[in-house]
Interface confidence: low
């Protein structure tokens, strides 16, 4: 089929286009080109007769068209009016006609765009700016670039007017950037030169540097002021309210104590009309001062308070040093130094943090030390202890009890007997006691500063007869070859002898047995199952004697390597297999069986009726003691022979 291809389809003004003919029929008489979508003599561009090779211009011929023998048409120096359809009329030798239509579009070659702005010096947080991409061009697409990147998503950015106009609402200093616009159509793309948005802002609150506020007499004072501002701020300095100079830096050489005072920097922006000021107080010391330590808490409470120790005064260009107990600071998460080392913070003080603390200021030649500071850490009272520790006394002796509790300030003590207040002293003395003095003796310690109180209660028994003792143990179920056990004979009594028996016999000599605490405590190291015996303690004095009930030690042990019985390993087919497993263990172990590695049952006895050679294999008994956490096992091979044969002989022998 006859077709027309436009090369290119989109044509720039002034360029050329070729209407290329495809599938031109054979045996042609000639052909003719027309402007438009149909054959119209008034709109003929050019005709061509093949036989004479003669081209004849038509009414629509402009002088820019060239026809080729293959019927293609070249149009040069394209103008906007050339846009549209073109029809080729082919006349064949048999005078049968054929037509085809093609088209192209003409676009102008875009000029380089430029950006116009409605506000060349917008003020931050106040003005909006509208950028417009010039010129306005039909059938053009408009794009915008900020710092050579596509537009960020922002509620303050708005495109309008077919994207020709970019509006920035409520501009900020961060909008100071390079803006470009771009125009595009199908035949060209052009980008504008950059426009830099000049946002007026500030001045912000000025900063005065350096931050130091303390100087030594004879030093130079060199203060610099800076405030973010566009255009750059104009600066003025005031000392104690009196104008000094209009410069960004203030320099005073060889300062004296008289230069102490308030120094004000004022920043002014002539375009925004705004002023901002910052004040710093400068202190000039006559000579390097001796440092001293200030504390934010003179009486901190243990485990409650933090203490901040600050080395005074604050001086420019100074290194601060700290010592605790005449040594440099230890590494501790509870000790924190501020960035300038001036402040030492003790987090959650303890009674061990009393110090002394010293700080130092390092000068060019020496280190000036502060006087030591000792922290008065309030703590306690801890649980009071009552001494002596006896609980049994004979009538007629003197009872002298002393109470002590760690505390700062020192605790105030009170004694109560059976809940009744006796006296407010640290010691309690009762002469010539009788059975009536038996009872509950309470010592109460009170810290008046923290308001905390702690008490300890002790039972005192006054009796001519010794009580029946009892045995306490620190481990009721020790594990063999692992644990130790300490038996203690209760109670602790004055002027009393303590004795021990094992299975009704006096103690054997053994490096694993040890008596301590006036023979009151018997310790068995590294217990064994043989230590599972009856232990008895006895007490005696010049008046009486008594013996405890026996305590039997329950030693956990095992499981030992199990034994499978019967010992036979060869069986005849058809017999019953009845295997029993036993392991020495306390408590009794849990049993389980595996045949050829496959778990079977959790019983001590494994029974299989009428075994066959299929029951050949390895039979494993597993034992487990949950109390000791230990395991053990044994494996036995079982061979089953067919009936009528002896194990080890071949069939038919």
């Amino acid at each position: 089929k006859l077709t027309i291809e436009s090369t290119p389809f989109n044509v720039a003004e002034g360029k050329e286009v070729l209407l290329l003919v495809h599938n031109l029929p054979q045996h042609l008489f000639g052909y003719s080109w027309y402007k438009g979508e149909r054959v119209d003599g008034n709109r003929q561009i050019i005709g061509y007769v093949i036989g004479t090779q003669q081209a004849t211009p038509g009414p629509a011929y402009s002088g820019r068209e060239i026809i080729y023998p293959n019927a293609s048409l070249l149009i040069q120096n394209i103008i906007q009016n050339d846009t549209g359809f073109y029809t080729l009329h082919v006349i064949k030798s048999d005078l049968v006609n054929e037509e085809a239509t093609g088209q192209f579009r003409v676009y102008p070659e875009l000029p380089k765009p430029s950006i116009s702005s409605n506000n060349s010096k917008p003020v931050e947080d106040k003005d909006a700016v509208a950028f417009t991409c010039e010129p306005e061009t039909q059938d053009a697409t408009y794009l915008w670039w900020v710092n050579n990147q596509s537009l960020p998503v922002s509620p303050r950015l708005q495109l309008s007017n077919g994207n020709r106009t970019l509006t920035l609402f409520n501009v900020t200093r961060n909008d100071t950037a390079s803006y470009k616009c771009e125009t595009q159509n199908p035949v060209s793309a052009r980008r504008s030169d950059s426009v830099i948005l000049n946002v007026l802002y500030g001045p912000d609150a000025p900063t005065i540097s350096p931050l130091n506020t303390s100087y030594r007499s004879g030093e130079n004072l060199n203060l610099s002021c800076h405030a973010a501002s566009n255009p750059p701020a104009q600066y003025s300095w005031f000392v104690n309210g009196t104008f000094q100079q209009s410069t960004q830096e203030l320099f005073i050489p060889n300062i004296t104590v008289n230069n102490s005072g308030s120094y004000t920097c004022q920043a002014h922006n002539s375009d925004t009309g705004l002023n901002r000021t910052t004040v710093t107080t400068i202190t000039v010391y006559a000579e390097p001062p001796k440092p001293f330590i200030t504390s934010n808490n003179s009486n901190p409470v243990e485990d409650e308070d933090a203490v901040a120790l600050t080395c005074e005064p604050e001086i420019q260009n100074t290194t601060y040093l700290w010592w605790v107990n005449n040594q440099s600071l230890p590494v501790s998460p509870r000790l924190q130094l501020s960035n300038d080392n001036r402040t030492l913070t003790l987090l959650s003080v303890t009674r061990n943090d009393v110090g002394p603390y010293e700080c130092g200021i390092q000068n060019e030649l020496s280190v000036d030390h502060s006087d030591p500071v000792i922290l008065n850490v309030l703590y306690g009272p801890d649980d009071p202890t009552i001494s002596p520790s006896y609980t049994y006394y004979r009538p007629g002796v003197n009872l002298s009890l002393s109470c002590h509790a760690a505390s700062n300030p020192p605790a105030q003590y009170s004694w109560l007997i059976d809940g009744n207040i006796q006296q407010h002293t640290q010691e309690l003395f009762i002469s010539n006691i009788t059975e009536k003095n038996s009872g509950l003796y309470t010592c109460q310690a009170n810290n008046s500063a923290s308001g905390h109180s702690r008490t300890t209660v002790k039972t005192i028994t006054v009796s001519a007869e010794l009580p029946k003792p009892s045995i306490s143990s620190n481990n009721s179920k020790p594990v063999e070859d692992k644990d130790a056990v300490a038996f203690t004979c209760e109670p602790e009594a004055q002027n009393t002898t303590y004795l021990w028996w094992v299975n009704g016999q006096s103690l054997p000599v053994s490096p694993r047995l040890q008596l301590s605490n006036g023979n009151r405590t018997l310790t068995l190291f590294n217990v064994t199952r043989n230590d599972a015996r009856a232990y008895v303690c006895g007490i005696q004095n010049s008046v009486s004697a008594n013996r405890s009930d026996p305590v039997t030690l329950d030693v956990l042990y095992g499981p030992d390597t199990p034994i499978i019985s019967p010992p036979d390993s060869s069986y005849l087919s058809g017999a019953n297999l009845n295997l029993s497993c036993h392991s020495a263990s306390n408590p009794s172990p849990q049993y389980s069986w595996r045949i050829n590695g496959i778990p079977q049952q959790h019983t001590q006895v494994l029974f299989i009726a009428k075994i066959t050679p299929n029951n050949n294999g390895t039979y494993a008994c597993f034992v487990s003691n949950l109390a000791t956490g230990r395991n053990n096992s044994i494996v036995k091979s079982i061979t089953v022979s067919a009936s009528g044969t002896s194990p080890g002989l071949s069939a038919g022998a």
Partner: nanobody, 119 residues
Framework: EVQLVESGGGLVQPGGSLRLSCAAS????????IGWVRRAPGKEEELVAD????????RYADSVKGRFTISADTSKNTAYLQMNSLRAEDTAVYYC????????????WGQGTTVTVSS
């Protein structure tokens, strides 16, 4: 070794709640102060809240007062940040840190947990 491990972050709708946890090891939180610091892109780092478990003292940034609650369980050596009425501007990576009682100076960062508040 001092270690701080945060957890509990996630995606939540505006108005929702989250509870962040900070498990401490290598030191006792009773001995110090623990804080929550947040970092969001394009914003300044902000100390949101801190607590000194030894005496229960707490501090909060103005932006979270009344919405966030900091607490500590000394038996578990863990600090918590209960965040209610969450807003889009609370979106950030939240870090647990040891904080100075006096000057809000902080160190010993955890690895952070991300909180995203979005509908």
């Amino acid at each position: 070794e001092v270690q701080l491990v945060e957890s509990g972050g996630g995606l939540v709708q505006p108005g929702g709640s989250l509870r962040l946890s900070c498990a401490a090891s290598g030191f006792n939180i009773k001995d110090t102060c623990i804080g929550w610091v947040r970092r969001a892109p394009g914003k300044e780092e902000e100390l949101v809240a801190d607590i000194c478990p030894s005496y229960g003292g707490t501090r909060y940034a103005d932006s979270v007062k009344g919405r966030f609650t900091i607490s500590a369980d000394t038996s578990k050596n863990t600090a918590y940040l209960q965040m209610n009425s969450l807003r889009a501007e609370d979106t950030a990576v939240y870090y647990c840190a040891i904080v100075s009682k006096i000057d809000q100076y902080y160190n010993y960062w955890g690895q952070g947990t991300t909180v995203t508040v979005s509908s």
